[in-house]
């Protein structure tokens, strides 16, 4: 629960949040996600770093790996083999991009309590995983895939053509990692470990982004990344499957691409194993409004994979792009051919559908003016999913169970009434066969993780309730938060307002708009956070508002696809509209309004500042996109089409920040970027700065040397301190 607010006599014992609190993470919370290893067992790393196995049914727990063993190789992560004979220990973690990293791996033999010697793994490894059954290993080293029958065996090399920045096997290149797969891996074991599927990405023809990494040497290093910007040559992807028992028999077999996809540029979007001999691949045209789901079967006689046209399912959007942020993935039922999938219904809301033969004959499972967000698990008799249906708040998430074994199927909200005030935003983690599950509540109160019986939904125990955090917050004057909506011209704008602790409607407060606003994003969520904006409200007396305008998610396709092919227009308009409505509320000092955002939010904040409305006194853009021609093809083209004359070049040119350089003359602008940003390249801010200089417009800027898109470590402290000074100066608040 949010700690109860104490008033009057006790109020003087309460203190406001400080910036130091935020930078030190004093009020961060913990979650508990069980590492499930069976229907009733899970692993968890204890406070003293032992790896402990818990059996829910016996109530017993025992240490399977001591902290001493972990420490002996400086392990920061572990993975138990499904046959429970081995554990891999991961150390020397070295981050690459958002998901990818390399590490050194040691294999510990639980049967004899020793590390496996002989045929040790090479280092550093780019990805490693156990087979789903037994203790086979697949790993990627120097862009090639290797297989081990058992940890002590010599490896079998599956691919030979891997080359840095050229050919990637079993791992994605930059753009697939960031914008399509959202993983560090691109290989998938079949359910019993018979086959291994993998992607090969050929980046040979992709233009390279190069930037300096200054380091400490006399000469800076140059970082080169094959990075396709909008309209550029894309990676060429191929999917292969190899028999892991007889890998040399016929070697890797390529899975055919559906003809309607292969006729022009395309993407591979995901792979889902159905059985050991049936696999489902999803493909997407480069113009991302057509997706094809293809179910392929192993032909024993030819040792090949057959993908009949009758098992191709097409998903097409006529009003926008296919899917939400990504095209949804199927969850197969026990018959191994029919599946459940989320896509838009006839009313333009994303809902669960059951597909047995064709998409046209799909049976709609959920419906209403709300959206199904995620399918967690399908069992013989139940389907568990999350949605924002409850009480019509799009920024909430509750977990539902639909009984699919009975007709008509009955629906039950598992979480809606558990801790109604404290918990309105849930996710879940299920054990095998959904025998048990963990619920993780993110707010709006203090987060709590609980364990539940999968049949009765009964709470078994609290896994993490953040008691220390609750106690620490008892003497803190937290801001008030409210989530409400504005109705403007048939558009519903949900907003979250963060108000100073002693908020008084009759007074005037400076307003800071925090914006992200990217397609299929959601900022107005019922989650707990004690962060920088909490401090700005608590200590500095600012009102902070977050607004979900057109282009944002989970409120239907009309709102979501409104920005299709027109990025940078309606997102900005809706922030401005909301600000005008906030002014009308009477407690905003209209001479002290600011806007800030990061990444896409930096783009929107820049455009809002340059909108010429006179509403904003100042604003901050952190690592902004400045022209869609500078950003990644996969992301950009999904929403904008191609930057060609016969497609959408005109709007690419019209939607740049640089084109509005003149309009920054009457605002205070702080532009911030990391020089080693692999995602939104420093180029974006360099071009804004150049345009402002050429227009003789004064502005403030800060770069962070050798920092990426996250501006982490010491840069974070410097960044928030710097932005705080800037805002306080803008709002004439004493330091």
């Amino acid at each position: 629960l949010r700690p109860s607010r104490v008033h009057n006599s006790e109020e003087n014992t309460m203190r406001a949040l400080t910036l130091k609190d935020i930078l030190n993470g004093t009020f961060s919370y913990k979650t508990f996600f069980p590492n499930w290893i069976s229907g009733q067992e899970y692993l968890h790393q204890s406070a003293d770093n032992n790896i402990v196995l818990y059996n829910i049914e016996t109530g017993q727990s025992y240490t399977i790996l001591s902290n001493r063993t972990m420490k002996s190789v400086n392990a920061s992560n572990y993975g138990l083999s499904p046959d429970r004979q081995f554990v891999y220990l991961e150390s020397d973690y070295s981050k690459l991009w958002r998901y990818s990293y390399t590490a050194t791996y040691y294999i510990y033999d639980l049967s004899n309590g020793e590390f496996v010697r002989g045929n040790e793994l090479p280092r550093p490894i780019q990805y490693l995983c156990w087979s789903p059954v037994g203790s086979k290993l697949a790993y990627v080293y120097q862009n090639n895939i290797y297989l081990k029958q058992r940890p002590g065996d010599p490896p079998f090399q599956i691919t030979f053509n891997g080359r840095e920045n050229k050919i990637f096997n079993g791992i994605p290149d930059w753009v697939y990692e960031e914008e399509m797969l959202a993983t560090k891996y691109a290989l998938w074991w079949s359910p019993n470990g018979k086959f291994l599927a993998y992607a090969e990405f050929n980046d040979t023809d992709i233009p390279v982004i190069a930037y300096s990494y200054y380091g400490d040497e006399q000469y800076p290093r140059t970082i080169n990344i094959p990075y396709p910007k909008a309209g550029a040559k894309n990676p060429v992807v191929r999917i292969f499957i190899i028999d892991t028992t007889y890998p040399a028999y016929v070697g890797p077999q390529e899975v055919p691409v559906p003809a309607m996809i292969a006729s022009s540029d395309y993407y591979f979007s995901w792979l889902t194993w159905v059985t050991d001999e049936r696999v489902c691949l999803q493909w997407l045209k480069r113009v991302q409004n057509v997706s094809v789901l293809s179910i392929c079967d192993f032909r024993e006689d030819w040792q090949t994979w057959d993908c009949p046209k009758t098992q191709e399912h097409i998903e097409e959007s006529r009003t926008g792009w296919a899917g939400g942020f990504f095209v949804s993935t199927p969850v197969f039922s026990y018959d191994a051919i029919s599946y459940y999938k989320i896509f838009s219904d006839k009313d333009g809301y994303k809902h669960i559908h059951y597909i047995k033969d064709t998409v046209e004959n799909a049976i709609q499972i959920t419906s209403g003016k709300w959206e199904a967000i995620n399918i967690f698990r399908v069992t013989q008799d139940s389907l568990f999913y999350s949605s924002n249906e409850f009480e019509e708040y799009p920024g909430r998430r509750n977990i539902y169970r639909i009984s699919i074994g009975s007709y008509p199927p009955s629906k039950k909200c598992v979480t809606c009434h558990l801790r109604k005030e404290r918990c309105q935003y849930y996710t879940a983690s299920f054990s095998d066969y959904a025998k048990y599950y963990a619920l993780v509540c993110y707010g709006p109160g203090i987060p709590i993780s609980t364990l539940h019986d999968g049949r009765t939904d009964q709470e078994i125990k609290i896994l993490e309730e953040n008691k220390e955090l609750e106690n620490a917050l008892k003497n803190i004057q937290l801001p008030k938060e409210e989530i409400k909506k504005l109705e403007v011209d048939e558009i519903t704008l949900w907003y979250k307002m963060i108000l100073p602790p002693q908020f008084d409607r009759s007074k005037k407060y400076p307003l800071l708009i925090q914006v992200y606003g990217g397609p299929c994003s959601q900022s107005v969520r019922s989650v707990f956070a004690v962060n920088w904006i909490s401090y700005l409200a608590s200590k500095e007396g600012m009102v902070i508002a977050l607004v979900d305008g057109r282009g944002t998610a989970f409120q239907g396709d009309k709102l979501l696809y409104a920005v299709y092919r027109k990025l940078g227009v309606y997102e900005v308009e809706d922030q401005i509209t909301a600000v005008r409505k906030f002014i009308e509320m009477g407690f905003i000092d209209e001479k002290r309004i600011a806007i800030w955002g990061w990444s896409y939010g930096g783009y929107v904040s820049s455009l809002a500042l340059a909108s010429g409305t006179g509403l904003f006194k100042c604003g901050i853009a952190v690592a902004p996109v400045s022209s869609w021609e500078y950003y990644a093809s996969v992301y950009t083209e999904r929403f904008m089409g191609l930057p060609t004359k016969d497609d959408n070049l005109e709007h690419y040119k019209n939607s740049t920040v640089m084109a509005r350089a003149e309009y920054f003359r009457n605002v205070d602008y702080l532009l911030i970027h990391g020089t080693a940003d692999d995602n939104v390249h420093f180029q974006n801010s360099a071009q804004i700065a150049k345009a402002l200089v050429n227009a003789q417009v004064d502005f403030q800027a800060m770069w962070y040397s050798d920092q990426n898109h996250g501006l982490s470590g010491l840069s974070t402290n410097h960044l928030y301190t710097h932005m705080t000074h800037f805002l306080k100066q803008c709002f004439s608040l004493s330091d």
Epitope: Q149, R150, D153, P154, F156, F160, Y246, Y249
Partner: antibody
Framework: EVQLVESGGGLVQPGGSLRLSCAAS????????MSWVRQAPGKGLEWVSW????????GYADSVKGRFTISRDNSKNTLYLQMNSLRAEDTAVYYC???????????WGQGTLVTVSS | DIQMTQSPSSLSASVGDRVTITCRAS??????LNWYQQKPGKAPKLLIY???SLQSGVPSRFSGSGSGTDFTLTISSLQPEDFATYYC?????????FGQGTKVEIK
């Protein structure tokens, strides 16, 4: 330590039968392809047969197809070779070997001699 | 079936010599080529797998190279314990075949 120990060899008349056994230890037997390789006196190595980890798939050299049958009992960690209709040219030392990835023979037994003679 | 041809069938060499044995496949076998050492009355022993990977415990004086159809086993400095017969072997299409062997004798 991986160990493979063959047994069952001996003298048999042409047309006769013999069953070879190979007891495996020191590794997870049920996880590997196993094989028989033979070597006639003073000659080179000749692969005879292989069997998949679970025992459902087998392969045979043309020279023994239809006469020899490979099998395994994973509960006993034992590999077998049933040899029927034996011929003089089947005389050889028979080695039990682990066929890793169906590609290379990484561990071998010491061999058992089969002599087919009248 | 794929035929494997080894050459020479025998060779005489002295301790410390560099010895090279070649193996040719009748069709491409990628890098699925292995080398074994066999001493009289003993079982063969794996030396090199996948054309160039040294089996654990095998001295580093042994090395393998090649891909496609032509492969080589090299002993960089022959030791007394290396006098033996060497076999190459392939296993594409799950039909393993061996070369006829190369006998390395003391000069």
């Amino acid at each position: 330590e991986v160990q493979l120990v063959e047994s069952g060899g001996g003298l048999v008349q042409p047309g006769g039968s013999l069953r070879l056994s190979c007891a495996a230890s020191g590794f997870t037997f049920r996880g590997y392809i196993m094989s028989w390789v033979r070597q006639a006196p003073g000659k080179g190595l000749e692969w005879v047969s292989w069997i998949s980890p679970e025992g459902s798939r087998t392969g045979y050299a043309d020279s023994v197809k239809g006469r020899f049958t490979i099998s395994r009992d994973n509960s006993k960690n034992t590999l077998y070779l049933q040899m029927n209709s034996l011929r003089a040219e089947d005389t050889a030392v028979y080695y039990c070997a682990r066929l890793l990835y169906g590609t290379w023979f990484d561990y071998w037994g010491q061999g058992t001699l089969v002599t087919v003679s009248s | 079936d794929i035929q494997m041809t080894q050459s020479p069938s025998s060779l005489s060499a002295s301790v410390g010599d560099r010895v090279t044995i070649t193996c040719r496949a009748s069709q491409s076998i990628s890098s699925y080529l292995n080398w074994y050492q066999q001493k009289p009355g003993k079982a063969p022993k794996l030396l090199i797998y996948a054309a160039s990977s040294l089996q654990s415990g095998v001295p580093s004086r042994f090395s393998g190279s090649g891909s496609g159809t032509d492969f080589t086993l090299t002993i960089s400095s022959l030791q007394p314990e290396d006098f033996a017969t060497y076999y190459c072997q392939q296993a594409t299409l799950l039909l393993p075949t061996f070369g006829q062997g190369t006998k390395v004798e003391i000069k």
